[in-house]
Interface confidence: medium
């Protein structure tokens, strides 16, 4: 027990002695952050001059503060112990380590290319002022159909599978919150709607049956004969589209 206590004391003394010797050998190691070891003044610690800083102790010089000029604006002022931090003026955003560059913002439906802001290619969209044009969701991959067409600014909205969309099927709605068992208002409304629809159809066919206008009848028959058409992704104007220069635009728009 006494032996281990002796070892600890001896180690502590050694460490303290080493630190003392180190500071005697190198007085600069005592200079804290925000100061520098001034060789011209007998190695005493001098505060960093204006517009300079030292973020660590024992430095022989202070670093020049970064200046946020032009497209850069100051996010954090320089202090004696830390450098200034810059960000970008409105209409630009940071790029690279420590916001070393400012990159132009684009509009929604565009992406930034080497030739400036370009519209998203057909089949892609960007809902932000930054970043890239992403491909539209491929609804068919999940066995769904396109409910709302995609644009340059918005993704497509997928609906139920084409099989679910028979002429009598109801429109897509988000699932209702779970309820306690019993006749919920939704169920009552549904049955009411179903009954009134059935009545309407009955009335409609009765009118049709006794209709004498052949031309009108032909028109109605044509409507019922038309197969169900699902929405198609309509073409967009592809002028100035960012997929025109595959080599230059990092792979262009090959989807």
């Amino acid at each position: 027990m006494g032996n281990s206590c002796y070892n600890i004391v001896a180690t502590l003394l050694l460490v303290l002695n080493f630190e003392r010797t180190r500071s005697l050998q190198d007085p600069c190691s005592n200079c804290p952050a925000g100061t520098f070891c001034d060789n011209n003044r007998n190695q005493i610690c001098s505060p960093c001059p204006p517009n300079s800083f030292s973020s660590a102790g024992g430095q022989r010089t202070c670093d020049i503060c970064r200046q946020c000029k032009g497209v850069f604006r100051t996010r954090k002022e320089c202090s004696s112990t830390s450098n200034a931090e810059c960000d970008c003026t409105p209409g630009f955003h940071c790029l690279g380590a420590g916001c070393s560059m400012c990159e132009q913002d684009c509009k929604q439906g565009q992406e930034l290319t080497k030739k400036g802001c370009k519209d998203c290619c057909f089949g892609t969209f960007n809902d932000q002022k930054r970043g890239i044009c992403r491909p539209w969701t491929n609804c068919s991959l999940d066995g769904k159909s396109v409910l709302v067409n995609g644009t340059k600014e918005r993704d497509v909205v997928c609906g139920p599978s084409p099989a679910d969309l028979s002429p009598g099927a109801s429109s897509v709605t988000p699932p209702a919150p779970a309820r306690e068992p019993g006749h919920s208002p939704q169920i009552i409304s549904f049955f009411l709607a179903l009954t009134s629809t059935a009545l309407l159809f009955l009335l409609f066919f009765l009118t049709l049956r006794f209709s004498v206008v052949k031309r009108g009848r032909k028109k109605l028959l044509y409507i019922f004969k038309q197969p169900f058409m699902r929405p198609v992704q309509t073409t967009q104007e592809e002028d100035g589209c960012s997929c025109r220069f595959p080599e230059e635009e990092e792979g262009g728009c090959e989807l």
Epitope: H93, C94, Q128, P135, N138, D155, E249, E250, G251
Partner: antibody
Framework: EVQLVESGGGLVQPGGSLRLSCTAS????????MSWVRQAPGKGLEYIGM???????HYANSAKGRFTISKDNTKNTVDLQMNSLRAEDTAVYYC?????????????WGQGTLVTVSS | DIQMTQSPSSVSASVGDRVTITCQSS????????LAWYQQKPGKAPKLLIY???TLASGVPSRFSGSGSGTDFTLTISSLQPEDFATYYC???????????FGGGTKVEIK
């Protein structure tokens, strides 16, 4: 301080459900694409899915059907609803925000929340 | 099916060594440049090192660099530092429904 904090993890029985939440402070989540990534003990990172700034949702094939991502812009949160949980879903679940300059890179991550599926 | 193959799975190196990790993607990543590299230490969340294949993320030391395009990518640590011992992951973004896929990871250990 800008940070993401996941919550809702814990022990759940196989077949059970769990809802994880990712809350942001210092940033407006609605302006970013937010993703969920998981990591099974001693294994690599696995992408679950993302919800775009305009509400577009994408899932990895492995997450389709059982997992649902949603967001609440008023609460500044993104949620991951997990159903029919299996033992292999045991993992640390992270939410991550896209980089300002690249939609497919995540430059802000939460600390993760552990989900254990066991009977 | 999307596949991201990272190699080697582990590497033993000493401080000051140059370390190279490669990542091979099938198919090509979106726009040929949608690839990121992450560093992860035990019990911690991943940290973004490089995005757009070669752009250094904010606050990342310049000893880290990324290169490559399309299907083949490389992360290089020019002079390994004690704090660099960790696991590194590549991750690619793809055009098919905005998927992201991670590589299997490379553990950089002390020799």
């Amino acid at each position: 301080e800008v940070q993401l904090v996941e919550s809702g993890g814990g022990l759940v029985q196989p077949g059970g459900s769990l809802r994880l939440s990712c809350t942001a402070s210092g940033i407006d989540l609605s302006a970013y694409h937010m993703s969920w990534v998981r990591q099974a003990p001693g294994k690599g990172l696995e992408y679950i899915g993302m919800i775009g700034s305009s509400g577009t949702i994408h899932y990895a094939n492995s997450a389709k059907g059982r997992f649902t991502i949603s967001k609440d812009n008023t609460k500044n949160t993104v949620d991951l609803q997990m159903n029919s949980l299996r033992a292999e879903d045991t993992a640390v679940y992270y939410c991550a925000r896209d980089s300002y300059n690249s939609d497919y890179a995540f430059n802000l991550w939460g600390q993760g929340t552990l989900v254990t599926v066991s009977s | 099916d999307i596949q991201m193959t990272q190699s080697p799975s582990s590497v033993s190196a000493s401080v000051g060594d140059r370390v190279t990790i490669t990542c091979q993607s099938s198919p090509s990543v979106y726009k040929n440049n949608q690839l990121a590299w992450y560093q992860q230490k035990p019990g911690k969340a991943p940290k973004l090192l490089i995005y757009l294949a070669s752009t250094l993320a904010s606050g990342v030391p310049s000893r880290f660099s990324g290169s490559g395009s399309g299907t083949d990518f490389t992360l290089t640590i020019s002079s390994l530092q004690p704090e660099d011992f960790a696991t590194y992951y590549c991750a690619g973004g793809y055009s098919s429904s905005s998927d992201t896929a991670f590589g299997g990871g490379t553990k950089v250990e002390i020799k």
